[in-house]
């Protein structure tokens, strides 16, 4: 697959995943009333990260927001935070990746800069996807725990014992938003990985190590920035280089390609 195609596909996949993460975060069906082996209620309850809803048999639906921060479970707050972090990172990732796309020309931005931006956006997408997957998984774990707790105690109170009145214990199971979140997180993660792979292809073999050769008296000495290591022209892993008096040129100008041992 060509680098452009890999980068473009990674971007599209991440974009779809990101849209899914936003959709999942906004959806009200994170948990839905379990209808199996339960008292059949004439109302259907479902809950999201931001509000809980009730659909009556007529189809009339009423939703109420969670207008408190302190009264909410810490786990719910954590899931909210993870999803928001995922969205924020996704937004940044999309903005960065738009500028990084090989098919889009922006000024005199070279492939090296685009590669770095592609890698950055890829990492952002990966983290965004991981945040969503963790958020959804934490919520799902919370649901499973509560489900079994309410199964063990289907009715709070002791029914006929001591004249106490039974209370209907509504059990909740996985809602559509969880599946949307898992898939979206996975897509964002895959898209991010594809962007990182594309970054490797975008990087010319020498683009990370631009050696500048200077004319040194009597000796062909190449000073390599970042390496701080001089090499005489006589080693087995150096080639003859054109050296110009009084000037310095990068090896890129001569289209020479260092071997993997050239730089330590």
């Amino acid at each position: 697959m060509s680098v452009t195609a890999c980068q473009g596909l990674g971007f599209v996949v991440s974009l779809i995943g990101f849209a899914g993460i936003i959709a999942a975060t906004c959806m009200d069906q994170w948990s839905t009333q379990d209808l199996y082996n339960n008292p059949v209620t004439a109302v259907f309850n479902y809950q999201g990260l931001w509000r809980s809803c009730v659909r009556e048999s007529s189809g009339f639906t009423e939703c109420r927001g969670y207008f408190t921060l302190l009264g909410l479970p810490a786990m719910l707050q954590a899931v909210r935070a993870l999803m928001i972090v995922g969205i924020v990172l996704g937004v940044i990732g999309i903005l960065v990746s738009i500028f990084a796309l090989k098919c889009i020309r922006i000024g005199s931005m070279d492939d090296s800069a685009k590669a770095k931006m592609t890698l950055t956006s890829g990492i952002l997408f990966i983290i965004s996807g991981i945040c969503a997957i963790i958020g959804v998984s934490v919520f799902a774990n919370m649901l499973v725990t509560n489900f079994w707790m309410s199964t063990a105690n289907m009715y709070s109170g002791m029914g006929g014992m001591g004249g106490m009145v039974q209370t209907v214990q509504t059990r909740y199971t996985f809602g559509a938003a969880l599946f949307v979140g898992w898939v979206a997180g996975g897509l964002t993660l895959i898209g991010g990985v594809m962007m990182c792979i594309a970054c490797r292809g975008l990087t010319p073999d020498d683009s990370n190590f631009k050696a500048v050769s200077y004319h040194a008296s009597g000796q062909n000495v190449a000073y390599r920035p970042g390496g701080f290591k001089a090499s005489t022209g006589f080693g087995s892993n150096t080639r003859n280089k054109k050296i110009y008096d009084g000037g310095a040129r990068t090896e890129d100008d001569e289209q020479s390609h260092p071997t993997k041992y050239d730089y330590v």
Epitope: A42, S52, S58, E62, T170
Partner: antibody, heavy 119, light 113 residues
Framework: EVQLVESGGGLVQPGGSLRLSCAVS????????MHWVRQAPGKGLEWVAY????????YYADSVKGRFTVSRDNAKNSLYLQMNSLRAEDTAVYYC????????????WGQGTLVTVSS | DIVMTQSPDSLAVSLGERVTMNCKSS????????????LTWYQQKPGQPPKLLIY???TRESGVPDRFSGSGSGTDFTLTISSVQAEDVAVYYC?????????FGQGTKLEIK
């Protein structure tokens, strides 16, 4: 004006069958769930069955489960109650009732049709 | 099944008097999702089908006089007529509209002295 008109009641022998119909007008029938409620002579109200607007949800009282079948034809604006294996205790006035939009209430009632099960 | 118990079975009051009747359910009719109680009150006058008075335990149906009011939560509910009129002579039923089967109370008969 909302109108619910029941028909099909009458005298039937124990073990016999009867089919009640309810003709509806004055509202979009296909958008509302419908109930059957009965009232034995001189007694209180007893809920019998419910069918949702799209027939996806159907519920029955324990006393009629397995013997009565509720159905609807949205094209004909009609609700039905097929009653089989009738018993003396099924003798009652049967009301066709619309399920209200709010609070699962039963907001519009027909005048009822009398079913008498007797030998 | 939820058992609905109404009290008293009947009561006789003078015109203009305030009257309250009670309804008790064997299970809570409160839904925490929307903080509503799924209890409905009906009025049935002699020879007529029932008429919806109150839903969600306390919300008056449109067209119902404001002398009728409902209250209560969970398992204990009350229907109050602030000033009884002659046309209020009827049997009043409460109904569980929360869990199937939707059960009715046995009714409270209101008469004028």
């Amino acid at each position: 004006e909302v109108q619910l008109v029941e028909s099909g009641g009458g005298l039937v022998q124990p073990g016999g069958s009867l089919r009640l119909s309810c003709a509806v007008s004055g509202f979009t029938f296909s958008s509302f769930g419908m109930h059957w409620v009965r009232q034995a002579p001189g007694k209180g109200l007893e809920w019998v069955a419910y069918i949702s607007s799209g027939t996806t949800n159907i519920y029955y009282a324990d006393s009629v489960k397995g013997r009565f079948t509720v159905s609807r034809d949205n094209a004909k604006n009609s609700l039905y109650l097929q009653m089989n294996s009738l018993r003396a205790e099924d003798t009652a006035v049967y009301y066709c009732v619309r399920s209200g939009y709010y609070g699962n209430s039963l907001d519009y009632w027909g005048q009822g049709t009398l079913v008498t099960v007797s030998s | 099944d939820i058992v609905m118990t109404q009290s008293p079975d009947s009561l006789a009051v003078s015109l203009g008097e305030r009257v309250t009747m009670n309804c008790k359910s064997s299970q809570s009719l409160f839904n925490s999702g929307n903080q509503r109680n799924y209890l409905t009150w009906y009025q049935q006058k002699p020879g007529q089908p029932p008429k919806l008075l109150i839903y969600w335990a306390s919300t008056r149906e449109s067209g119902v006089p404001d002398r009728f009011s409902g209250s209560g939560s969970g398992t204990d509910f009350t229907l109050t007529i602030s000033s009884v009129q002659a046309e209020d002579v009827a049997v009043y039923y409460c109904q569980n509209v929360y869990i199937y089967p939707l059960t009715f109370g046995q009714g409270t008969k209101l008469e004028i002295k």
